[in-house]
């Protein structure tokens, strides 16, 4: 049917509470296309009736809830004038009790349900709702190990859980509750997230200098390989940590089973005021999921991104 | 529709207090953070500190820790901002704010204002 | 406390003409979650402020697509494609990262 197959990581998700999915590929789903949802290869569209459990909402896929029977392979097809894409998209769902201590560790959720906080400072977290413009999100809630979360180092703000002084006891399991409402109805969403703590290495009193990257996008085509380098300069008896980042987690934990984003090893050139550190982020075969994303260079204090972009189409 | 509506213009003598109200309708009072913003004269906007409705949970900036107090009465949807010790760098005008949504920030809603004088 | 740096002070500008401020914060805006807690607001003569931007790029409700807002982390820009008389008033950047919220100290700008 001439449509060129791209497939998306897999989506692990929770049943009984809802769920949508946006079909976005950057950069035709920003001019004149058409978006089709379609379940295991059906020929039938998903229905765009709003009062159905499943169904599309713009370009939006929409589960009011989602079931244990939804898993599968959802394919959206984006039209254009004179292109044709097929996204397919695997979702498995599980059953999940986030309170019963008795059922086993959770499958491999994604990590926006792996969050990190750094020790000492002030931080947060942040409950991702990724929702299309019909659903309404209430008033959302936070816990800890169950139990509704209050006092003072704590304020919800937005979709945000500001943690300030963050201790040690401040990791575990953590869940974000809000209330969606859509079409008059009420549904709750849950979402569960682990929060570890890391201590950032001491600044040495130095601030370091980011040379390169410089907060700024790149442009790459899908399917390639790229490496990117931090370069950084600093103090020659600094003891700051140079690392990359993705969702503010280190990028060899958050590829940890694909492997297919790298941090390099740190090299150094000493000159005789500082040192110039790089490390590199490699990407073995840069994917959809990867553009617009920020990946940030970490130097003690000192952070800067880059964004990978699709190359504007050549009407040549 | 939302709605912020603020208590009238006061004038303090320095060493007072004010107390300004902020009457919400159109929406559910206790899902949302009410803010207060002052202005002084001519000068930019300032950040005072939050109240949340739902539980009297109070976020200050710092500057205003030890003269701030915030306060609601659920049954009108009104939240009260009370400045003590008064000077004459607290003449400014008061603004209470909403956010867009409870999920997005910036402040969409605002009240009318109300004009603080401190004056001897 | 973060920092919001505005320039320039004052703009004069035709109307139908483009015009541009800029804002600069001491800290970078842009979360992990990839969300820039950055917003520009405009205060007319008179008014209360009303938001223009929300999170460095997304338009608010009812503002005209003339306005247009960009930037990096720490870097922003509000664009006007062509100014209208409508448009005058102090334009205000503002974070809202962490507490407490910052305000910068506002560009005023008028009609030539």
């Known amino acids: 049917d001439g449509c060129k197959d791209i497939f998306m990581k897999n989506e692990i998700l929770s049943a009984s509470q809802p769920f949508a999915f946006n079909c976005t590929f950057p950069p035709i789903t920003s001019g004149e296309v058409s978006v089709t949802w379609y379940k295991n290869s059906s020929k039938i569209p998903v229905s765009k009736i709003i009062q159905s459990r499943i169904h599309q909402d713009e370009t939006w896929i929409l589960f009011l809830p989602m079931e244990w029977g939804d898993s599968g392979v959802y394919q959206c097809v984006i039209k254009g004038r004179d292109s044709c894409h097929r996204i397919h998209v695997n979702l498995t769902v599980f059953e999940k009790h986030w309170c019963d201590t008795s059922i086993g560790g959770l499958p491999n959720l994604s990590d926006e349900y792996k969050q990190i906080l750094h020790l000492g400072k002030d931080d947060s977290l942040t409950c991702h709702l990724h929702f299309p413009k019909s659903c309404v999100l209430g008033p959302i809630k936070w816990y800890k190990d169950c139990n509704e979360i209050k006092g003072e180092r704590f304020t919800v703000l937005e979709t945000r859980l500001l943690v300030s002084n963050v201790s040690a006891e401040d990791r575990g399991n953590y869940a974000c509750q809000a209330i969606l409402t859509h079409s008059g109805k009420q549904y709750e969403v849950l979402n569960g997230i682990t929060v570890s703590i890391t201590e950032r290495a001491g600044y040495g009193g130095s601030v370091p200098k980011i040379i390169y990257p410089k907060n700024h996008s790149i442009e790459v085509q899908l399917g390639t390989t790229l490496i990117v380098d931090c370069n950084v300069t600093d103090t020659k008896d600094n003891t700051n940590l140079r690392c990359w980042r993705v969702n503010n987690t280190l990028v060899d934990d958050y590829y940890d089973e694909s492997k297919r984003i790298r941090e390099g090893v740190e090299t150094h050139v000493s000159f005789r005021e500082h040192n110039l550190y790089t490390v590199n982020i490699t990407f073995l075969e840069v994917k959809m999921e990867d553009y617009g994303l920020p990946f940030m260079c970490h130097a003690g204090v000192s952070t800067a991104y880059i964004i990978l972009q699709l190359p504007a189409p050549d009407f040549r | 529709q939302v709605q912020l509506v603020q208590s009238g213009a006061e004038v303090k003598k320095p060493g007072a207090s004010v107390k300004v109200s902020c009457k919400a309708s159109g929406y559910t009072f206790t899902n949302y953070w009410m803010y207060w913003v002052r202005q002084a004269p001519r000068q930019g906007l300032e950040w005072m500190g939050m109240f949340h409705p739902s539980n009297a949970v109070t976020r200050l900036n710092q500057k205003f820790k030890d003269r701030v107090t915030m306060t609601r009465d659920t049954s009108t949807s009104t939240v009260y901002m009370e400045l003590s010790s008064l000077r004459s760098e607290d003449t400014a005008v008061y603004y209470c704010?909403?956010?867009?949504?409870?999920?997005?920030?910036?402040?969409?809603?605002w009240g009318q204002g109300t004009l603080v004088t401190v004056s001897s | 406390d973060i920092v919001m740096t505005q320039t320039p002070l004052s703009l004069s500008v035709t109307p139908g003409q483009p015009a541009s401020i800029s804002c600069r914060s001491s800290?970078?805006?842009?979360?992990?979650?990839?969300?820039?807690?950055f917003y520009w607001y405009l205060q007319k003569p008179g008014q209360p402020p009303q938001l223009l931007i929300y999170q460095m790029s997304n338009l608010a409700s009812g503002v005209p697509d003339r306005f247009s807002g960009s930037g990096s982390g720490t870097d922003f820009t509000l664009k006007i494609s062509r100014v209208e008389a409508e448009d005058v008033g102090v334009y205000y950047c503002a974070q809202n990262l962490e507490l407490p919220l910052t305000f910068g100290g506002g560009t005023k700008v008028e009609i030539k």
């Open positions: 800290k970078s805006l842009l979360h992990s979650n990839a969300i820039t807690y």
């Open positions: 704010a909403r956010t867009t949504s409870m999920i997005i920030g910036g402040f969409a809603y």
